[in-house]
C-alpha cells in the first residue's frame, strides 16, 4: 500500500495549527470498516492518534490532535495537530493498514518569528571617540536558534569582538542577546540582524552613535608619512605619536591599533592597562613610553603576510587617528646560472641562460646585459612563484645566440630594498663546457 | 610550491549546513591568507572570504555574509568553510585557494574543489 | 563592487594564430589584475598576476597589457594546449572579482 506524505517538513509557527499530510488511494469498494490509521512518533513509536474498528478512537497526544474525518474515506489521513508547541517538533509517522499496510513519516518543524531586537549601549552617555563600547542587540522569542549579523553604517560585516548567546525560556522559545565591543569612530551607525532561518525572517535594529567633541579639537596623532620597511622575520616599529596635555595620565587612554581595511583589533591599551595582542601574540607596546605620547607599536617576526596598512586610533577626552603602512621585504639571494645545452658549445649555437635567485620580496626586476653593458631585451622569459613562507624565487631565462665570445650579466634588484644581485657567466669562442672543468 | 586537498563531493537538502574542509601542506600556514571562491557549472567565479589562520582574522564578501563562516585549525593546516541555510543557488564547485596577504588578492595555488549539490 | 566585464564569451582561432582578450574595469584597478586558465574538469591556474608578473611555469607566448581599467590578455602562437576558458580578476579591492570568462575554441 503506498502511503505518501510531503518531503519537505511542514513548518508550523509556535500556537498555530499545523495539518500533518497523509495519504492513501483506496480501491474501489474500499470502506471506513477495513482502515486501521495509526499516527505515533516516528522515533518512540509513541502512539500520537488511530483509527480502527471503523471509528475514530480518538487523540493520545493532549487531545491536540484531529483526524478529518468526512476525508478519510478518499484517502485523506491527514493528522491536525492544534496549538503548536516548540516541543512537538519531530517526526510523525502515518501507518495505513486496509488489506495491506504501508507507512511513511513527516517531520514537523517549529517556527516563530523574533521580535525587532532592542539595542542597549554601555556606557550610554559622555561618550567620545576611541571609547570602547558594548553594543547588546536582544531578540525575543523565536524558534529555532537565530543567526546573527552585525554590520557599520557602509554595510561592512563586523565580526570580531562579537558574543551571542541564546536561551530558551519557559515556552521554549529562544531569547537571543549578541554583544558588539567596538572603538567609536567619529560617528557611526551599527547595525544587528537577527535571522530566522526556518522562516527566512530577518528583524532588524541599528543605533547611530555621535560622540562628544571636546572644545580644544581633535587629538592629533602623527605617523611616518612613508611606509615603514621591514624585512622577513625581523621586528618592525610602526611609530605613532600623540602630544600628551598637563596632568594626563594613562588611565584617561584608550589606544587601539587596528587592521585599517577590515577594521580588526591588533592591539589595545585600554582602563589604564595593557590589553595585550590580539595579533597571534606578535605585537607589543612600548608601556614605559606611553605616557610620554609614544603609542608605537612593535610588530615582531615580521611575516609577509603583515605587510598592509595599520591604523593607530588615540583617544583621551577628545579622538584621533592615523594610519600607517608596514612594506615587507626580502633581500635576493645572489644569482645562480645556468646554461643550457652546457658543453661542447660553439660560436653560432643558440643557449639558454637561466638566472634563478631565491626568497626575496616583492616581486623582483630583473635586468640583462652583455660583456658591454648593452642591454638585453629581447629573448627574456621571467617568473616568479611564492615559496611556503610567501617570499619569491625568480627564474629570468634568456635565449641567445653565441658570438666569438661573451659575458652575459644578470641583475635581479629588490625594488623596495633598492638591493641588486649580480650574477654573470662567460662563454669563450673556442669548444667549452660549462661550468669550466677544474 | 604546496598543495591545498578538498573533501569530497557533497549532496545535501535545502535548509541543511554544510562544512567543507581544505588540508594543506607544503607551505607554512600561517604564512598564507587562505580564500574560498564559487563557481557555478558553466559560470565564473565568486570571491567568499578570507581567513588568515596567524590572528585567525576573515574578511567577508558581504554577498556571502551570513551564508558562510570560515575557520582553521592550525594543527592540522587545515581551513574549513560551513555553508548555512543552504538552496539550490549553492549548487557550486567551491574552491580553496591561496594567496600571500590581504592586498595581494590573487591565487596562485587552488584545490581541486568541493562539488556541492543542493537538492530535495 | 567592482565589475570585470570580458566582452567577448568565445573566440574561435587556429593554432598558431595570435589571439588578444580583451578584459574592462568599471573602476580603476591600477595594475592589479590578474589571470587565470581553466580547463574542464580542473582549477583555475594562475598566470599572470600584477598586470604583467608571469607566475613560474608560465610559457612565454602569454603577455599581458594595459592598466586603469582597460586590459588585454594575449597569446602570440596558440597550441593545441591553450584551448580553455580564460578569466581576468581584479585584485585592487575586496570583494576581489572576476570577469566572465572568455573560451578559446578552436575553428
Known amino acids: 500500500l503506498e502511503v505518501q506524505v510531503p518531503e519537505d517538513p511542514v513548518v508550523a509557527l509556535v500556537g498555530t495549527d499545523a495539518t500533518l499530510c497523509c495519504s492513501f488511494s483506496p480501491e474501489p469498494g474500499f470502506s471506513l470498516a477495513q482502515l486501521n490509521l495509526i499516527w505515533q512518533l516516528t522515533d518512540t513509536k509513541q502512539l500520537v492518534h488511530s483509527f480502527a474498528e471503523g471509528q475514530d478512537q480518538g487523540s493520545a497526544y493532549a487531545n491536540r490532535t484531529a483526524l478529518f474525518p468526512d476525508l478519510l474515506a478518499q484517502g485523506n489521513a491527514s493528522l491536525r495537530l492544534q496549538r503548536v508547541r516548540v516541543a512537538d517538533e519531530g517526526s510523525f509517522t502515518c501507518f495505513v493498514s486496509i488489506r495491506d499496510f504501508g507507512s511513511a513519516a513527516v517531520s514537523l518543524q517549529v517556527a516563530a518569528p523574533y521580535s525587532k531586537p532592542s539595542m542597549t549601549l554601555e556606557p550610554n552617555k559622555d561618550l567620545r571617540p576611541g571609547d570602547t563600547v558594548t553594543i547588546t542587540c536582544s531578540s525575543y522569542q523565536g524558534y529555532p536558534e537565530a543567526e546573527v549579523f552585525w554590520q557599520d553604517g557602509q554595510g561592512v560585516p563586523l565580526t570580531g569582538n562579537v558574543t551571542t548567546s541564546q536561551m530558551a525560556n519557559e515556552q521554549g522559545l529562544f531569547d537571543v542577546h549578541s554583544i558588539l565591543r567596538v572603538v567609536l569612530g567619529a560617528n557611526g551607525t551599527y547595525s544587528c540582524l537577527v535571522r530566522n532561518p526556518v522562516l527566512q525572517q530577518d528583524a532588524h535594529s541599528s543605533v547611530t552613535i555621535t560622540p562628544q567633541r571636546s572644545p580644544t579639537g581633535a587629538v592629533e596623532v602623527q605617523v611616518p608619512e612613508d611606509p615603514v620597511v621591514a624585512l622577513v622575520g625581523t621586528d618592525a616599529t610602526l611609530r605613532c605619536s600623540f602630544s600628551p596635555e598637563p596632568g594626563f595620565s594613562l588611565a584617561q587612554l584608550n589606544l587601539i591599533w587596528q587592521l585599517t581595511d577590515t577594521k580588526q583589533l591588533v592591539h589595545s591599551f585600554t582602563e589604564g592597562r595593557d590589553q595585550g595582542s590580539a595579533y597571534a601574540n606578535r605585537t607589543a607596546l612600548f608601556p614605559d613610553l606611553l605616557a610620554q605620547g609614544n603609542a608605537s607599536l612593535r610588530l615582531q617576526r615580521v611575516r609577509v603576510a603583515d605587510e598592509g596598512s595599520f591604523t593607530c586610533f588615540v583617544s583621551i577626552r577628545d579622538f584621533g587617528s592615523a594610519a600607517v603602512s608596514l612594506q615587507v621585504a626580502a633581500p635576493y639571494s645572489k644569482p645562480s646560472m645556468t646554461l643550457e645545452p652546457n658543453k661542447d658549445l660553439r660560436p653560432g649555437d643558440t643557449v639558454t641562460i637561466t638566472c634563478s635567485s631565491y626568497r626575496g620580496y616583492p616581486e623582483a626586476e630583473v635586468f640583462w646585459q652583455d660583456g658591454q653593458g648593452v642591454p638585453l631585451t629581447g629573448n627574456v622569459t621571467t617568473s616568479q612563484m611564492a615559496n611556503e613562507q610567501g617570499l619569491f624565487d625568480v627564474h629570468s631565462v634568456l635565449r641567445v645566440v653565441l658570438g666569438a665570445n661573451g659575458t652575459y650579466s644578470c641583475l635581479v634588484r629588490n625594488p623596495v630594498l633598492q638591493q641588486d644581485a649580480h650574477g654573470s657567466v662567460t662563454i669563450t669562442g673556442q669548444p667549452m663546457t660549462f661550468p669550466p672543468e677544474a | 610550491q604546496g598543495q591545498m586537498q578538498q573533501s569530497g563531493a557533497e549532496l545535501v537538502k535545502p535548509g541543511a549546513s554544510v562544512r567543507l574542509s581544505c588540508k594543506t601542506s607544503?607551505?607554512?600556514?600561517?604564512?598564507?591568507?587562505i580564500s574560498w571562491l564559487k563557481q557555478k557549472p558553466g559560470q565564473s567565479l565568486e570571491w567568499i572570504a578570507w581567513?588568515?589562520?596567524?590572528?585567525?582574522?576573515?574578511s567577508y564578501n558581504q554577498k556571502f555574509t551570513g551564508k558562510a563562516q570560515l575557520t582553521v585549525d592550525t594543527s592540522s593546516s587545515t581551513a574549513y568553510m560551513q555553508f548555512s541555510s543552504l538552496t539550490t543557488e549553492d549548487s557550486a564547485i567551491y574552491y580553496c585557494?591561496?594567496?600571500?596577504?590581504?592586498?595581494?588578492?590573487?591565487?596562485?595555488?587552488w584545490g581541486a574543489g568541493t562539488t556541492v549539490t543542493v537538492s530535495s | 563592487d567592482i565589475v570585470m566585464t570580458q566582452s567577448h564569451k568565445f573566440m574561435s582561432t587556429s593554432v598558431g594564430d595570435r589571439v588578444s582578450i580583451t578584459c574592462k574595469a568599471s573602476?580603476?584597478?591600477?595594475?592589479?589584475v590578474a589571470w587565470y586558465q581553466q580547463k574542464p574538469g580542473q582549477s583555475p591556474k594562475l598566470l599572470i598576476y600584477?598586470?604583467?608578473y608571469r607566475y613560474t611555469g608560465v610559457p612565454d607566448h602569454f603577455t599581458v597589457s594595459g592598466s586603469g581599467t582597460d586590459f588585454t590578455f594575449t597569446i602570440s602562437s596558440v597550441q593545441a594546449e591553450d584551448l580553455a576558458v580564460y578569466y581576468c580578476?581584479?585584485?585592487?579591492?575586496?570583494?576581489?572579482?572576476f570577469g566572465g570568462g572568455t573560451k578559446l575554441e578552436i575553428k
Open positions: 600584477s598586470a604583467s
Open positions: 581567513i588568515y589562520a596567524g590572528p585567525g582574522y576573515t
Open positions: 573602476q580603476d584597478v591600477s595594475t592589479a
Open positions: 607544503g607551505f607554512t600556514f600561517s604564512s598564507f591568507y
Open positions: 580578476q581584479q585584485h585592487y579591492s575586496t570583494p576581489w572579482t
Open positions: 585557494a591561496r594567496h600571500v596577504g590581504r592586498q595581494r588578492g590573487y591565487f596562485d595555488v
